[in-house]
């Protein structure tokens, strides 16, 4: 079974002799989720040719996956701690519905998919404690999420495979940008 950061895991940074700071805990947590995404991507790429597909852009247009942009204040250019933190939390909240969609998309990595979902929820809680401007964080409407989930699950097999690939790729990219930004804070 997947191990959460803080427990005994060789996939995350070596344990420190003193307790982890809040920033170190968040860093370790993101890296743990990224390891999980990596395992899920491996299964996805092994079972279909989506990872090399040139039709990505076509499918990507129908998905509204969170993406970092210059205006979000998370890049080195125009870096803004408060704006960036709001973007990271908002983005993670928006990804939750897509992570829910992933739950029935894996056979051998079913537990790993669940671990990524649960760890993301914990990460959001960590980050909300760190954020000063919680009012600026918009939470997606449950009804909107429910209808999006239904729509995604109604796609044909090829589109479902492509959606899975795009969600994992985008989430990985979003988390990596978040990790780089959080290390500046």
């Amino acid at each position: 079974a997947p191990v959460l950061p803080g427990e005994d895991s060789k996939d995350v940074a070596a344990p420190h002799s003193q307790p982890l700071t809040s920033s170190e805990r968040i860093d370790k947590h993101i890296r743990y989720i990224l390891d999980g995404i990596s395992a899920l991507r491996k299964e996805t790429c092994n079972r279909s040719n989506m990872c090399e597909s040139s039709k990505e852009a076509l499918a990507e247009n129908n998905l509204n996956l969170p993406k970092m942009a210059e205006k979000d204040g998370c890049f080195q250019s125009g870096f803004n701690e408060d704006t960036c933190l709001v973007k990271i939390i908002t983005g993670l909240l928006e990804f939750e519905v897509y992570l829910e969609y992933l739950q029935n998309r894996f056979e051998s990595s079913e537990e790993q998919a669940r671990a990524v979902q649960m760890s993301t929820k914990v990460l959001i809680q960590f980050l909300q404690k760190k954020a000063k401007n919680l009012d600026a964080i918009t939470t997606p409407e449950p009804t909107t999420n429910a209808s999006l989930l239904t729509k995604l699950q109604a796609q044909n097999q090829w589109l479902q495979d492509m959606t899975t690939h795009l969600i994992l790729r985008s989430f990985k990219e979003f988390l990596q940008s978040s990790l780089r930004a959080l290390r500046q804070m």
Epitope: A13, A14, E24, D27, I30, R31, L34, D35, I37, S38, K42, E52, K67, M68, A69, E70, C74, F75, Q76, S77, R169, S170, K172, E173, F174, Q176, S177, L179, R180, R183, Q184
Partner: antibody
Framework: QVQLVESGGGLVQPGGSLRLSCAAS????????MTWVRQAPGKGLEWVSS????????AYADSVKGRFTISRDNAKNTLYLQMNSLKSEDTAVYYC????????????????WGQGTQVTVSS | DIQLTQSPSSLSASLGDSVTITCQAS??????LSWYQQKPGQTPKLLIY???KLQTGVPSRFSGSGSGTSFTLTISGLEAEDLATYYC?????????FGQGTKVELK
């Protein structure tokens, strides 16, 4: 096999511009972070700039910020470094490097390096 | 900015010796440290990433350790082909930075 081939170096006067290119082959270019590293004659390595895969996120060393621009064309498998307002201290061999990929998702490390292109800034 | 202090700047050793190079970061960089080897007239080569992970194809006499602010590269049993300059790199926080280098020569 993985190959990185730099071009565009040369002799330029202070205040001038150059555009370096790095043609990548043997791997899925769009999936990897790419970085420029330079080495002045008889000196150590200096990290110059990195560009990430899909986000368009870039980062620069303080010594080149505002003068250099890193970019990539994933369709052409090419990395670029636009260098403006060049100074004599920019004289160096410029290496194009690929960041570790595959399952290594967070660790920075440059596993493939081009042969380098010489940039000389002198009047 | 995070500063890296590499020491010593040069060292002389005999073949078969165990050689240790250290890299000190001015603040914690977790395990985001890599080590490179550069021989005269050649391009740098990645030896160690993630502070302690051996890059594929690198001889097992090379090892890395440390986390936080203190890191070590060890060559257990120096060979003639190991005579080179070694650099550490922090990839934790922008701007990323290399150490000043350590030149390993024959005694």
């Amino acid at each position: 096999q993985v190959q990185l081939v730099e071009s565009g170096g040369g002799l330029v006067q202070p205040g001038g511009s150059l555009r370096l290119s790095c043609a990548a082959s043997g791997f899925t270019f769009s999936n990897y972070y790419m970085t420029w590293v330079r080495q002045a004659p008889g000196k150590g390595l200096e990290w110059v700039s990195s560009i990430y895969s899909f986000s368009g996120d870039t980062a620069y060393a303080d010594s080149v910020k505002g003068r250099f621009t890193i970019s990539r064309d994933n369709a052409k498998n090419t990395l670029y470094l636009q260098m403006n307002s060049l100074k004599s201290e920019d004289t160096a061999v410029y290496y194009c490097t690929r960041n570790l990929g595959g399952v290594v998702v967070t660790t920075n490390g440059y596993d493939y390096w081009g042969q380098g292109t010489q940039v000389t800034v002198s009047s | 900015d995070i500063q890296l202090t590499q020491s010593p700047s040069s060292l002389s050793a005999s073949l078969g010796d165990s050689v240790t190079i250290t890299c000190q970061a001015s603040q914690s960089i977790s395990d985001e440290l890599s080590w490179y080897q550069q021989k005269p007239g050649q391009t740098p080569k990645l030896l160690i990433y993630g502070a302690s992970k051996l890059q594929t194809g690198v001889p097992s006499r090379f090892s890395g350790s440390g986390s936080g602010t203190s890191f070590t590269l060890t060559i257990s049993g120096l060979e003639a082909e190991d005579l080179a300059t070694y650099y550490c790199l922090q990839g934790y926080r922008w701007p990323f930075m290399f150490g000043q280098g350590t030149k390993v020569e024959l005694k």
